[in-house]
């Protein structure tokens, strides 16, 4: 069973008085509609809330917009709707906050139907004062504003222009017509997709891939039969059109579009698709789609260059394009990705990697858990963890798994023990490891959330009723203690703490419901005095991440070096404070065959470790051979995994081979191996 | 099976230092945090610090902040203990232990192999 | 620091007796305790680790329980070779021992 709260528990002292003086009740004197909340800047406490009303009156609907400004934490919320001349705003464009600690905000306006164009509000001073500005367009996207600079933003428009302005939304320029997508790339530069004939779905396949890198004076065409385009960490993946069919591969650049290399990946068919699941500077994760409509498909993780693939996960559950995958980067521990495969009995079964997609097995069971009644075996099941397809298809699950980069090695999520994910209720687990072990931490499903870097998780029970209870720990789960935060219970509609998980703040958000109205109110949490005092050299202890075994030289070695953590205790309780940084000393291993994957024309055999060459190359790898660079076609045979940063050891010498002349074949007529360069 | 071997007796002035040496074999000293604990003449232990080999972690008991200084050596498979400013009430015997370990944390489980000991006499 | 607090400082037993000695610690500890067996002139001995499991090659009369603050190591029939000083060491926070049980021969 789950830890208790008894005498054991009881960590935190008087703690009722403490929380009591740090609640901060506010009702807000509007109808119940919907709400979204921002948080604007970093650390400064500054929180947005949009309320909107709608009434649906015979020809139109009616709609009211309140926006309201905390700037302590939501403790305390002004009406500022007069800032914005009580217009109503549009909630599909939600409130478009700058990056980093700019302080800009947009807000899009709803305007009557006969206007020339749109209307936005916009703050560069944290939503102190907003300025009015009538558009030349109808926007169709939220403003877009630049990573590098946020005077920069860009829209698209409802007639698909791409409308670009370099003083914040003051002033703005349609710089290209029949543009179907737009992203920023870094320095500023602009990415899109345009159409020639008659639109976006028409042309899918025929679009031109265009780049600008000065705001729209000049434009580079760096790509054509195009059906889509992505970025992902320092790649440009576009998926092309194949010349003699209607299936489309994979393209990479590294160069924003200067050069392009195909990728060494199936092409796909008109019903299936691509999706980047994760991304960085080093590699990717690409989910490439099964034929048919199975659900499923495989996952394969690149090399350094995005070129070479190797396959790392099959049966990858994802659910049509733009579908659910429960595919999660377990943000606490370097390396970690947790995701769901379809099994032949069309159960889905969690699977975790540990070493960037190298190898995936399934969750330890948790020590203090017992398999489900459908277990085949009662002794030997796993943990299998709810995300969002669970959520899609309306499960008992109010969240998705969290883990956060300066709580490190935590990891909290809804599961279920057994053979496969269960459709009972939920509980909740938490991993203190980065998905090593776990241990059920709640019974049934609730809302949570980590402060202080992991100093405190907060939770709140998921319920149809009125709720009027919080639960927090400050031992990573182990013991909990529940705190009344007020005597009428509320309808509960969600959990607000700023991003980031450095804030002591959490925010209560829910309705209260009378006879005759319903009103939204939230109360704000600090914990700041449940944790007296700073935390000190004495309350950290050191830890090694992905440790297995002791006794192997290299234990806690990932991708060519082990690092070692300062922790916080559990008993600990104490504030790590909102500067606090994670301490972590790295250290590098020694190379083995491990630290590298097989280059073109190479492949593992089952349980070796050595590459070896393939006698034959067929389907996407002939492709490739036929149709990529020349220099992608010379190698030893091993590529050192992205991110590895092994040294001595182990060093896979071996001769460089051509493998161009395997680029022959009877089936390919002679005009094709003449262009087998590109 | 892991040894810990220790160095010799020693006696020393008060305001002295002394640098016990603890040398491991048999295993991956690498891996494992390595603990000092004295006793002085018919008391209890007492754990001065540790240190993790890889990366030189040491960390240190308030007592002893300041005066103790806990170091390894990764290619000799030693780590050293040395006290400084020396006073009678440091006479003990000063055992090593490797710190057990089944997780990634390296104090929590126990120490489960013991050094055979180093008398350090203090006197004038 | 934390402290802990060992009792009684000295039991005497005899053979055959069912020993049990409790280690108090001032804050939870979770269960990251440990119990040593010492015999004079020797190093001390790790007889259980994490409040309740057996280091491999110590005898299943030896068992230990608890969590939070309270612990117990218990000797469920004391032999010959159990009379001995026996200590509790936390390890949550900095290391810390309790004072140290004699059990001697009554």
């Known amino acids: 069973s789950a830890p208790g709260e008894d005498e054991e528990c009881g960590r935190v002292r008087d703690f009722v008085a403490k929380l009591a003086n740090n609640t901060h009740q506010h009702v807000f004197d509007d109808l119940r509609g919907s709400v979204s909340l921002s948080w604007v800047g970093d650390s400064t406490g500054v929180i947005l809330v949009l309320t909107t009303f709608h009434v649906p009156l015979v020809i139109m609907t009616f709609g009211q917009s309140k926006l309201y400004r905390s700037e302590d934490y939501g403790k305390n919320f002004k009406d500022i709707t007069d800032l914005i001349n009580n217009t109503f705003i549009r909630t599909e464009f939600g409130m478009a906050i700058g990056p980093e600690n700019s302080g800009k905000v947009v807000l899009t306006a709803e305007v009557s139907g006969g206007s020339r164009g749109g209307r936005i509000f916009r703050s560069s001073d944290f939503a102190k004062n907003f300025v009015q500005t009538d558009l030349p367009f109808h926007p169709l996207t939220q403003m877009m504003y630049s990573p590098q600079n946020s005077d920069y933003l860009l829209a698209l428009s409802t007639e698909n222009g791409l409308w670009v302005s370099k003083n914040f939304g003051g002033k703005w320029e349609e710089i290209h017509k029949a543009v179907c997508l737009a992203k920023w790339g870094s320095d500023n530069t602009i990415f899109f997709t345009t159409y020639a004939n008659g639109s976006c779905k028409a042309d899918l396949g025929a679009l031109e891939l265009w780049r600008t890198s000065d705001l729209g004076k000049s434009f580079k065409t760096i790509g054509v039969k195009i059906y889509s385009f992505g970025l992902g960490g320092r790649f440009l993946f576009a998926s092309v059109m194949a010349d003699k069919d209607t299936t489309r591969r994979i393209h990479v650049s590294t160069d924003q579009g200067d050069t392009w290399s195909m990728a060494q990946l199936p092409s796909v068919g008109q019903e299936q698709f691509y999706s980047i699941l994760a991304a960085n500077d080093d590699m990717v994760f690409m989910h490439v789609d099964e034929p048919g409509d199975t659900g499923f498909g495989t996952i394969f993780t690149s090399d350094d260059r995005g070129i070479v693939y190797s396959k790392s996960l099959d049966r990858h559950l994802y659910t049509t394009t733009g579908g659910e995958t429960d595919f999660t980067n377990v943000t606490s521990l370097r390396g970690v990705y947790i995701t769901s495969v379809l099994s032949e009995d069309n159960s889905i079964q969690t699977m975790i990697t540990f070493d960037q997609g190298g190898r995936w097995t399934h969750l330890r069971k948790p020590e203090n858990s017992e398999c489900d009644a459908a277990a085949k075996n009662k002794n030997e099941c796993s943990l299998h963890i709810h995300a969002s397809y669970s959520i899609s298809q309306k499960l008992n699950v109010p969240m998705a798994p969290l883990s956060e980069p300066n709580a490190v090695g935590i990891v909290i999520a809804h599961g279920s023990v057994g053979d496969a994910i269960s459709v009972m209720v939920p509980d909740v687990y938490i991993s203190d490891d980065g998905g090593y072990s776990w241990t059920k931490m709640l019974e049934g499903p609730h809302y949570y959330t980590i402060l202080d870097s992991g100093g405190i998780i907060v939770a709140i029970e998921h319920s149809s009723r009125p709720i009027n209870v919080i639960k927090f720990s400050t031992d990573e789960g182990q013991c909990w203690q529940t705190y009344t935060f007020t005597r009428d219970p509320i309808y509960f509609t969600g959990l607000a703490s700023e991003p980031g998980a450095r804030s002591m703040n959490i925010s209560i958000w829910g309705f209260t419901e009378s006879f005759l109205t319903s009103q939204w109110v939230s109360y704000t949490i600090d914990f700041k005095d449940i944790l007296e005092r700073n935390c000190e050299e004495k309350d950290y202890t050191i830890w090694l991440a992905h440790s297995t075994d002791p006794e192997d030289y290299e234990d806690g070695c990932i991708l060519g070096y082990k690092e070692q953590f300062l922790r916080l205790r559990k008993s600990s309780v104490c504030q790590n404070g909102r500067d606090y940084v994670v301490t972590k000393q790295p250290s590098i291993c020694l190379c083995s065959l491990e630290d590298f994957l097989c280059d073109f024309g190479y492949y593992r055999p089952e349980n070796d470790s050595k590459c070896v060459e393939q006698p034959e190359l067929k389907g996407h790898d002939l492709e490739f051979c036929l149709y990529g660079r020349e220099e992608h076609l010379t190698t030893n045979g091993y590529r050192k995994i992205p991110g590895d940063k092994c040294q001595g050891g182990v060093n896979p010498v071996r001769e460089v081979k051509d493998l161009k002349k395997k680029c022959t074949s009877n089936f390919l007529s002679p005009e094709k191996q003449n262009s087998k360069s590109n | 099976q892991v040894q810990l071997v220790q160095s010799g007796a020693e006696v020393k002035k008060p305001g002295s230092s002394v640098k016990v040496s603890c040398k491991a074999s048999g295993g991956t000293f690498r891996n494992y945090a390595i603990s000092w604990v004295r006793q002085a003449p018919g008391q209890g232990l007492e754990w001065m610090g540790g240190i993790i080999p890889i990366g030189g972690w040491a960390n240190y008991a308030q007592k002893f902040q300041g005066r103790v200084t806990i170091t390894a050596d990764e290619s000799t498979s030693t780590a050293y203990m040395e006290l400084s400013s020396l006073r009678s009430e440091d006479t003990a015997v000063y055992y090593c232990a490797r710190q057990g370990r089944k997780t990634g944390y390296y104090y929590y489980y126990g120490m489960d192999v013991w050094g055979q000991g180093t008398t350090v006499t203090v006197s004038s | 620091d934390i402290q802990m607090t060992q009792s009684p400082s000295t039991l005497s037993a005899s053979v055959g007796d069912r020993v049990t000695i409790t280690c108090r610690a001032s804050?939870?500890?979770?269960?990251?305790l440990a119990w040593y067996q010492q015999k004079p002139g020797k190093a001390p001995k790790l007889l259980i680790y994490?409040?309740?499991s057996l280091e491999s090659g110590v005898p299943s009369r030896f068992s230990g329980s608890g969590s939070g603050t309270e612990f117990t190591l218990t000797i469920s029939s004391l032999q010959p070779d159990d009379f001995a000083t026996y200590y509790c060491?936390?390890?949550?926070?900095?290391?810390?021992f309790g004072g140290g049980t004699k059990v001697e021969i009554k």
């Open positions: 804050q939870s500890i979770s269960s990251w």
């Open positions: 060491q936390q390890a949550d926070g900095h290391i810390t």
């Open positions: 994490k409040a309740s």
